[in-house]
């Protein structure tokens, strides 16, 4: 069976200010067993954006239900957005592990330019 | 087999506190979210409070907030719900309940409950 | 805090008879409505999660649809075990909110 690979398809994104950005991302293979998490950002400086495992997120809703046993579509959609939002977004699969889960395999990023507001 | 077994219920005056323990095993709990969720006698159901599975995300209900406080030992397989300043309305069977990975997954394994009786 | 609204309250039926059970939410909830099945003196039980998925080893003549705002569990067939109170909850957004419940009694 071929390893996983993260795919996010889009280079780059360009959104008006104020509106919903959607940043795509699908995995090819259910395995390994894992969360998937979208950072801002690359390092140990990254922003996490989103945590399929853990909490809530009020600004990012997922395109797909993620509670479906055998999904593989990632993307999420970030709401409201300004040019603070800009940035790389990469989404990571992590293998699960003990205590902690372990990074598995991230996408290649996708640029999220922002477009300010005409006055 | 998956098991919650709650433990810690009785009867409290109103004003003291109560801590509830839920003993999980048959899953890897570490993996889990887990919720308290409560029933008044011939009342429906109602959230307490969850906390994610490393413990980084706690949410309350607004009827608990400032008097409960959830926390988990995931070395020892236990969620915890410390009760204080109890009131009469906090007469509930008390369950925890688990939640597989993010906020949106549902409860799929509920304990039998432990029953807590707020009175003078 | 988003609020579910079950109706019926409460439904006498018999045997055999489909019944239907709505679950409205006072905002969206996408697809992430749950439905549980409770007993007299016993914890609930998860039937359906995410509006239309069975969860495992639940009976098949349970079924649920919806999405956004607008929930049914259905039951094809009545069985003589399926008599309780059943719940809808939402986990779209904190609070986690329930439905007040429907009682499902013999006829």
């Known amino acids: 069976e071929e390893e996983l690979q993260v795919i996010q398809p889009d280079k780059s994104v360009l959104v008006a200010a104020g509106e919903t950005a959607t940043l795509r991302c699908t995995a090819t293979s259910l395995i390994p067993v894992g969360p998937i998490q979208w950072f801002r950002g690359a390092g140990p400086g990254r922003e996490l954006i989103y945590n399929q495992k853990e909490g809530h997120f009020p600004r990012v809703t997922t395109v797909s239900d993620l509670t479906k046993r055998n999904n593989m579509d990632f993307s999420i959609r970030i709401s409201n957005i300004t040019p603070a939002d800009a940035g790389t977004y990469y989404c990571v699969k992590f293998r699960k592990g003990s205590p902690d889960d372990v990074e598995f395999k991230s996408g290649a990023g996708t640029e999220l330019s922002v477009r300010a507001k005409p006055s | 087999e998956v098991q919650l077994v709650e433990s810690g219920g009785g009867v409290v005056q109103p004003g003291r506190s109560l801590r509830l323990s839920c003993a999980a095993s048959?899953?890897?709990?570490?993996?889990?979210?887990m919720i308290w969720v409560r029933q008044a006698p011939g009342k429906g159901l109602e959230w307490v409070a969850s906390?994610?599975?490393?413990?980084?995300?706690?949410y309350y209900a607004d009827s608990v907030k400032g008097r409960f406080t959830i926390s988990r030992d995931n070395s020892k397989n236990t969620l915890y719900l410390q009760m204080n300043s109890l009131r009469a309305e906090d007469t509930a069977v008390y369950y925890c309940?688990?939640?597989?990975?993010?906020?949106?997954?549902?409860?799929?394994?509920w304990g039998q409950g432990t029953m807590v009786t707020v009175s003078s | 805090a988003i609020q579910l609204t079950q109706s019926p309250s409460s439904l006498s039926a018999s045997v055999g008879q489909r019944v239907t059970i709505t679950c409205g939410a006072s905002?969206?909830?996408?697809?992430?409505m749950h439905w549980y099945q409770q007993k007299p003196g016993k914890a609930p039980k998860l039937l359906i999660y995410?509006?239309?998925n069975l969860e495992a080893g639940v009976p098949s003549r349970f079924s649920g649809s919806g999405s956004g705002t607008d929930f049914t569990l259905t039951i094809s067939s009545l069985q003589p075990e399926d008599f309780a109170t059943y719940y809808c909850?939402?986990?779209?957004?904190?609070?986690?909110?329930f439905g007040q419940g429907t009682k499902l009694e013999i006829k």
């Open positions: 309940a688990r939640r597989y990975y993010g906020f949106n997954y549902p409860f799929d394994y």
């Open positions: 048959g899953f890897t709990f570490s993996d889990y979210g």
């Open positions: 906390i994610s599975s490393s413990s980084s995300y706690i």
């Open positions: 905002k969206s909830v996408r697809t992430y």
């Open positions: 995410s509006a239309s």
């Open positions: 909850q939402q986990s779209n957004e904190p609070p986690y909110t």
